[in-house]
């Protein structure tokens, strides 16, 4: 009974289409598959950024796979052929591994790369990224930002840079159509007359870096002798009401400070009849139903009641 063997896939490679971290892994079928014409051969692919503890593993019948990587680090991948048990009258047969690696050939010493890169998607409408020049660069150094997400034909360069002392230190992005809930890739590279500049790569999803506007139209309503309802409206803009969490800060007679986090645009506060003054502010953040993370908005304008009995007056800012 001869042992059944199968070769690993051929021409296994990692291809960089210029999408700043979104790479293609591709291969060709193994040699000598003639004996297994009736078989659907599968491939087990493992890949990771070099230094990562864990491999991502997929099993596919295709000859390609695409995924995002951190180009600040190298990438390693390996693949082998799988013959299902149906093809071999017994147990599954695996080939040896074919392996490949890929990394951007980096330039420049670490003091040349940008520092403190920070991107915020204001009100789910306007993306702004800012950075500081590398600690060791001269004023002749300029940085360029490129970005890509699935849906763009190719990586685009920023067209509206924020400048300081003639150097690019940020980018205001144009309207980004259908760009959320998918990886957004950025590369900041640079040029200088006297030294190569280290590129930096960043990946995030836009819905996770949203900073909303603060809530508006804060009001008080007396619900009963010992309850006051605080109300506000969702911030203006495209973010739906179901996507908000709120944090309220309430100050009663300049002493008691109450803070609370709520999901709705109301909050009921227990008070005493002696309450002479009541002030509150609210801020908003995108909640876990719409994103994995987010940034608190600025606080709203303060809304205060003082003097008159709240039962006689409902205040609107």
């Amino acid at each position: 009974d001869t042992e059944i063997k199968v070769n690993p896939p051929q021409d296994f490679e990692i291809v960089d289409p210029g999408y700043l971290g979104y790479l293609y892994l591709q291969w060709q079928p193994p040699l000598s598959l003639d004996h297994f014409k009736e078989c659907t051969v599968e491939y087990e692919l493992k890949y990771r950024n070099i230094g990562s503890e864990t491999w991502k593993t997929i099993i596919t019948k295709n000859l390609h796979y695409k995924d995002g990587f951190d180009l600040n680090k190298g990438i390693e991948a390996k693949i082998h052929t799988l013959l299902p048990w149906q093809c071999t009258n017994g147990s599954e047969v695996q080939s040896s591994w074919a392996e490949t690696t890929y990394w951007i050939s980096p330039q420049g010493i670490p003091e040349t790369k940008v520092q403190d890169m920070d991107c915020v998607y204001y009100n789910w409408q306007y993306l702004l990224c800012s950075w500081k020049p590398g600690i060791g660069v001269l004023l002749d150094t300029n940085y360029n930002l490129f970005y890509w997400y699935e849906g763009l034909d190719h990586a685009l360069q920023c067209v509206d840079y924020i400048k300081a002392d003639g150097q690019n230190i940020g980018c205001r992005f144009p309207y980004l159509e259908a760009s959320d809930y998918k990886d957004f890739y950025i590369c900041v590279n640079g040029s200088s007359e006297n030294k190569p500049i280290r590129s930096s790569y960043f990946t995030f999803q836009l819905q996770n870096i949203v900073k909303p506007l603060p809530p508006v139209y804060l009001t008080f309503t007396r619900e009963s002798s010992c309850e006051i309802k605080l109300k506000w409206s969702i911030p203006l803009g495209p973010i739906p009401a179901r996507c908000f969490d709120y944090e309220i800060e309430i100050r009663e007679d300049d002493t008691t400070l109450v803070t609370a986090t709520v999901e709705n645009e109301t909050y009921t506060l227990k008070t005493t009849n002696e309450t002479r003054q009541l002030c509150f502010v609210v801020r908003s953040k995108v909640n876990i139903y719409c994103s994995d993370d987010g940034i608190w908005s600025e606080w709203s304008d303060k809304q205060c009641w003082e003097g008159e009995d709240l039962s006689k007056k409902t205040l609107l800012r």
Epitope: I50, K73, W103, I109, P110, E111, I135, G136, L138, N194
Partner: antibody
Amino acid sequence: EVQLQQSGPELVKPGASVKISCKTSGYTFTEYTMHWVKQSHGKSLEWIGIINPNNGGTNYNQKFKGKATLTVDKSSSTAYMELRSLTSEDSAVYYCARPSATHYFDYWGQGTTLTVSS
Amino acid sequence: DIKMTQSPSSMYASLGERVTITCKASQDIKSYLSWFQQKPGKSPKTLIYRANRLVDGVPSRFSGSGSGQDYSLTISSLEYEDMGIYYCLQYDEFPLTFGAGTKLELK
């Protein structure tokens, strides 16, 4: 010829401070950063931090934050490192070192020996 | 911080012998590695940068190789003036970190 000339040996008491200098010549001082490296007796090298003489920007090894302060005097093309609250652990040879455009390090000072002893 | 593990810590070798010193980084450092030689009472001297590029004026018996996390310095035929301590340095990211050193002595 590029030269990095460091100040002479120092003997100081615990708790005191010391300021080591690194006078440069043979190149434009503001066109390259300056790094400082510590070598304890019979031990390896430790990177302390970097300063950009052009704008005074610094980056420190976390281990030396609060211990070392890097400064420059552009007029004399000199870099300085001040070490404070000295203990015997700070006894070492300290080097200034300059990178090239592509790597660390192109030029080194001759080293300054610091001895902390009561 | 990136840890650089250098080996051996010391070694004895004969003149004319081929000598190899290794450095392993705790993560991929993308060939941002320099090798230095230091003699007693002297400042370190750079021999190799970017893992395999020889500094001008350094004898061609010195060579560097490696990628990812693993790097080595080789002296193809040891000469007397090569005695000293050798250090690797990663400069992929701050803080820069050195290996613990390899003391090379004559057998």
